[in-house]
């Protein structure tokens, strides 16, 4: 029962494909596809693939909701990761090992290398690989604030699980602060949630990168999966482009 | 340099207005405007205006973001409120007054009257009127779980303030649970956030409805502004309509 | 009395003029426009002789595709088999049968339209809507459509029966 | 919802999300994106009827608002509702870069 | 953003949010909604050019994508981006009801 013109589906698809061609270049602020003349032969480095997979996994976990997109968010974000300073570093000696907390420190020079300006950072996530957990545990994340004080950031209720699982905390504001300040090393603390009445405040959850006494090769694998910051930022050259172009809107 | 037809702005406006006519009736599941034959003379009752204003204030505080809207969310939601059981009720005697917590109980029969089926509830907010606060305070909200155990729900960092301010906690899941269970009275606890090291765990914040020793008339005003649950739910008759209509999507 | 017309000159615009009454106002509308129900605005009169598409039903979500005919008046559509009338997927639902709006559009009832060209004793004559001529290929597929007054019949070949929902002749499953 | 679950398994004529896989090499002639090789971009297509609401409303027509013109637009249009980002790997000179492009994958559509 | 701040103070010809106040009595002939008396519904209007991207890309064209076709649609359309709900008070019989209608006020638009 139709007198409608049939839609030329192929034309619509072609127009969509052509629009995507422009969209991707536009999001990357490229006038044309980048030259491939310097690309070395062979597959992508392992570290790059790991980073790509981290990002892809994050996307899969994201709710697919549209958000009003400020202009800066339209453009592509470079993804980098900065691993936690290894636990044998002297910085950890200053913080007494307690049953209720673990500490994670980051080198701000590495952060600055990845994100030169605080304003360029669009998202920072602290990623922790949580190992098996026998009981439910309520944990809290704190930011190192001043000499010996900690500022509460967020909390998470961890369900018991037989398999390891990545935990992700949004720490964008904190990392932006760190990039603005002069400190060399900054850190987080993951603690058991302590209620005012409760006495048992032990951190039961085992986070990869803190367990000691491993065989050499295992320790290396373990170390690769130690806590890290996943950073999404506008590359500096793209940001300068953003500022210099006059915007009507 | 235009060969475009000029847009008939008046026609577009008329079409938008006509579409809104249908949209409002459609959202209210009305086939035509409701009869006004039974409407009493005079202004709207105070309680209704207060409820309308609460809802309007909530809207103003909401971020104007589009959310993928499930079919049930398209239709209008009836707004009601259920006040906390007054503090002289015996239920409060069972919970020792502590420096770090206050308790809020609700009559589930009142909740059920407002929302007969758990599935009809689309949002429940616990609203507390926070009075002046001299220092920053980190508070936590708990739900009464079993005899003497409490389940953590959420937390809030309250900034110092000279003026009273409404606090709002999303407790949709909890109220949905309560509607499903048989209990007569259910409750929340607002506590100071207790860190594992800290000793000073006093709840500094003053919540309207808990301060004693007021003059009679003040106590009444005070009581009207005591904690309440703001409920948004699909009216039962509209829900039956929703279930009965066949949906291809 | 407040003169609403001088207080708000935009009342009744753009398709009419404002006329003040005691305690109220009404709109005097331009040609081709008619006052709204409350007489506080002017809306376009859908000329009965405008020809647009006739839509079969609103049950199917693809009703933009369920076009009975493409060049029919609102009366021809709504006073016969149509559920909606319009074009480019912009649809005026036909008034519900037996409502005041239906009687206003179809004063002679289902199956008839008024013919303003033929006037008997000052009253427009009604004529039967020939559904077969207007909708034949869509309402009597695989059969022979015969116009009746009012309505139509669809005759099917032996071994077939007419399915009133599908509007076509369907093989009898023996 | 007019999402991939509903639309890919139905023959919906009206507004719906439609399948479209883009292979960077085949469709765009690009070899410079090293990962992924392509992605399910999808797109929205199909009419969103505008229903002139008469004073005599009735349920059958009103029920259609939810799908066909929930935003009461003067000219409703089939557009993306839920979108997802796409991470890509490409080289700038000798340096491989991982970048995330926002709002690249259409998961569902709506009349708006 | 194509929001009320920008659009109401400019003469933007392209996609933008346009002012529209709806007075329930005057515009709809309705006296049954007791609160509010009307509301700023607004609406989206204006073209969203489709830019055929040629193999010879150049910055001038690419810069337009962000505004005119950020979603890389085959037929971009000016639609609401940020919406707000509207609470209303009306009577059912003798009983006053407060109800909230979702997505009624258009705050900003986008090409989608």
């Amino acid at each position: 029962l139709s007198t409608c013109k049939t839609i030329d589906m192929e034309l619509v698809k072609r127009k969509r494909i052509e629009a995507i061609r422009g969209q991707i270049l536009s999001k990357l602020r490229l006038a044309s596809p980048p030259s491939q003349g310097e690309v070395p032969p062979g597959p992508l480095p392992e570290a790059v693939l790991a980073l790509y997979n981290s990002t892809r996994d994050r996307v899969a976990g994201e709710s697919a909701e549209p958000e009003p997109e400020p202009e800066a968010d339209y453009y592509a974000k470079e993804v980098t990761r900065v691993l936690m300073v290894e636990t044998h570093n002297e910085i950890y000696d200053k913080f007494k090992q307690s049953t209720h907390s673990i500490y994670m420190f980051f080198n701000t020079s590495e952060l600055r290398e990845a994100v030169p300006e605080p304003v360029l950072l669009s998202r920072a996530e602290l990623r922790l690989l949580r190992l098996k957990l026998k009981v439910e545990q309520h944990v809290e994340l704190y930011q190192k604030y001043s000499n010996n004080s900690w500022r509460y950031l967020s909390n998470r209720l961890l369900a018991p699980s037989d398999s390891p699982e990545w935990l992700s905390f949004d720490v964008t504001g904190v990392v932006r602060q760190w990039l603005s300040r002069g400190g060399e090393i900054e850190g987080f603390r993951l603690s058991a949630h302590c209620s005012c009445d409760s006495r048992d405040n032990t951190l039961q959850v085992d986070i990869n990168g803190f367990t000691t006494g491993r065989r050499g090769d295992l320790a290396t694998i373990h170390g690769m999966n130690r806590p890290f910051l996943l950073l999404m930022a506008t590359p500096l050259e793209r940001a300068q482009h953003l500022q210099s172009s006059r915007h009507r809107r | 340099l235009s060969t475009c037809k000029t847009i008939d702005m008046e026609l577009v406006k008329r079409k938008r207005i006509e579409a809104i006519r249908g949209q409002i009736l459609s959202k209210l599941r009305l086939a035509s405007p409701p009869s006004q034959g039974e409407v009493p003379p005079g202004p709207l009752p105070e309680a209704v205006l207060a409820l309308y204003n609460s809802t309007r204030d909530r809207v103003a505080g909401e971020s104007a973001e589009p959310e993928p809207e499930p079919e049930a969310d398209y239709y209008a939601k009836e707004v009601t409120r259920v006040l906390m059981v007054e503090t002289h009720n015996e239920i409060y005697d069972k919970f020792k007054q502590s420096t770090h917590s206050i308790y809020m109980f609700f009559n589930t029969s009142e909740l059920r009257e407002a929302v007969p089926e758990p599935v009809l509830l689309s949002r429940a907010e616990l609203r507390l009127l926070r009075l002046k606060l001299k220092v920053e305070q980190h508070v936590e909200l708990y739900q009464k779980y079993s005899n003497n155990s409490w389940r953590y729900l959420s937390n809030r960092l309250l900034a110092p303030s000279d003026s009273p301010e409404w606090l709002s906690f999303d407790v949709t899941g909890v109220v949905r649970q309560w509607l499903s269970r048989g209990g007569e009275i259910e409750g929340f606890r607002l506590s100071a956030h207790c860190s594992c090291d800290s000793r000073d765990n006093t709840l500094q914040v003053d919540i309207n409805g808990f301060t004693t020793g007021r003059r009679g008339d003040l106590a009444t005003i005070h009581g009207m502004n005591r904690p309440f649950l703001l409920l948004m739910a699909t009216p039962l008759e509209r829900a039956q309509h929703l279930q009965s209509s066949r949906h291809r999507r | 009395d407040i003169d609403e017309c001088s207080q708000d000159p935009s009342l009744c615009l753009p398709h009419g003029a404002c006329k003040n009454l005691q305690g109220s106002y009404v709109c005097v509308c331009d040609e081709g426009f008619t006052p709204t129900q409350d007489q506080h605005g002017c809306e376009e009169v859908e000329q009965p002789h405008h020809k647009k598409e006739c839509y079969l039903n609103f049950d199917d979500t693809v009703f933009c595709d369920s076009v009975l005919a493409t060049n029919v008046t609102q009366q021809e559509c709504c006073c016969s088999l149509g559920a909606g009338w319009g074009d480019h997927c912009e649809i005026y639902p036909c008034p519900v049968y037996s409502s005041a709006e239906f009687h206003s559009l179809c004063p002679d009832g289902k199956g008839y339209t008024q013919d303003n060209n033929i006037v008997n004793y000052g009253i427009p004559a009604h004529r039967d809507i020939d559904e077969c001529m207007l909708f034949g290929s869509e309402i009597c597929k695989e059969g022979k459509c015969v116009n009746t007054q009012p309505g139509y019949e669809c005759y099917c070949k032996q071994g077939f029966y007419y399915d009133g929902n599908l509007l076509e002749c369907v093989d009898v499953d023996e | 919802a007019l999402d991939t679950n509903y639309c890919f398994s139905s023959t919906e004529k009206n507004c719906c999300v439609r399948q479209l896989y883009i292979d960077f090499r085949k469709d765009l002639g690009w070899k410079w994106i090293h990962e992924p090789k392509g992605y399910h971009a999808n797109f929205c297509l199909g009419p969103c009827p505008y229903i002139w609401s008469l004073d005599t409303q009735y349920s059958k027509v009103l029920a259609l608002y939810n799908q066909h013109n929930p935003g009461a637009s003067a000219a409703p249009c089939c557009v993306p509702q839920a979108l997802e980002p796409l991470p890509i790997v490409y080289y700038v000179g000798r340096k491989p870069k991982v970048e995330q492009l926002s709002n690249m994958i259409v998961r569902s559509c709506k009349c708006s | 953003a194509l929001d009320t701040n920008y659009c109401f103070s400019s003469t933007e010809k392209n996609c933008c949010v346009r002012q529209l106040y709806i007075d329930f009595r005057k515009d709809l002939g309705w006296k049954w909604i007791h609160e509010p008396k009307g509301y700023h519904a607004n609406f989206c209007l204006g073209p969203c050019p489709y830019i055929w991207s040629l193999d010879t890309q150049y910055s001038k064209v690419l810069a337009l994508y962000n505004q005119h076709n950020p979603g890389a649609s085959a037929a971009p359309c000016c639609v609401p981006q940020a919406l707000e709900p509207l609470p209303i008070v009306y009577y059912v019989g003798r009983k006053p009801k407060v109800e909230q209608l979702s997505n009624m006020i258009v705050r900003s638009c986008k090409c989608s």
Epitope: S35, Q36, G37, E38, V39, P40, P41, G42, P43 | - | - | R25, K31, W32, H34, Y91, G93, R94 | -
Partner: antibody, heavy 119, light 107 residues
Framework: QVQLVESGGGVVQPGRSLRLSCAAS????????MVWVRQAPGKGLEWVSA????????YYADSVKGRFTISRDNSKNTLYLQMNSLRAEDTAVYYC????????????WGQGTLVTVSS | DIQLTQSPSSLSASVGDRVTITCRAS??????LNWYQQKPGKAPKLLIY???NLQSGVPSRFSGSGSGTDFTLTISSLQPEDFATYYC?????????FGGGTKVEIK
Amino acid sequence: QVQLVESGGGVVQPGRSLRLSCAASGFTFSDYAMVWVRQAPGKGLEWVSAISGSGFTTYYADSVKGRFTISRDNSKNTLYLQMNSLRAEDTAVYYCARVSSGHWDFDYWGQGTLVTVSS
Amino acid sequence: DIQLTQSPSSLSASVGDRVTITCRASQSISSYLNWYQQKPGKAPKLLIYAASNLQSGVPSRFSGSGSGTDFTLTISSLQPEDFATYYCQQTYTVPLTFGGGTKVEIK
């Protein structure tokens, strides 16, 4: 259209040197890595050497490492292969080819130039 | 170095035949494999890149498949102009290596 033209081949005695050139046209030369591939008479293809678009990075087959040098002059759109200490087993048709992408497929080839190393 | 072994080294076929040539790598090379066609006295011509992608301008009767260590070049219906020698090439790691070639002759 893309064109690659090799030159500089010929007969040379073992231990001597030869310089091959490849003139490129029809594309932005500096945007592409380039390679030399050779084919001994009646035999299969053997990759010899490669160079990145800027000339910054070079790669060699073990059989020629230390004897052959690949270079390019982007201002002249020309690729070179300097062959020193030539051996009889270096006798082959030498092709220059363009590296199409980061995948290192060779999408355009020259017609080849014959190098004969013989005493 | 990564060795590529092509089989068969030669084959005879008729016009219209379906022809399959295989290439096996001495270790996994993911999809970093290309196929070339070479006619006597001519330069090689790229047919397939990245194991399965048809180079622009190459007839669709040519197709490539495989990943890891085992790869296949298929000519769905052999044409007179397809009689030539076919080489596989890995670009997974330097040194880049070619297979020994497969000569397709007229039966």
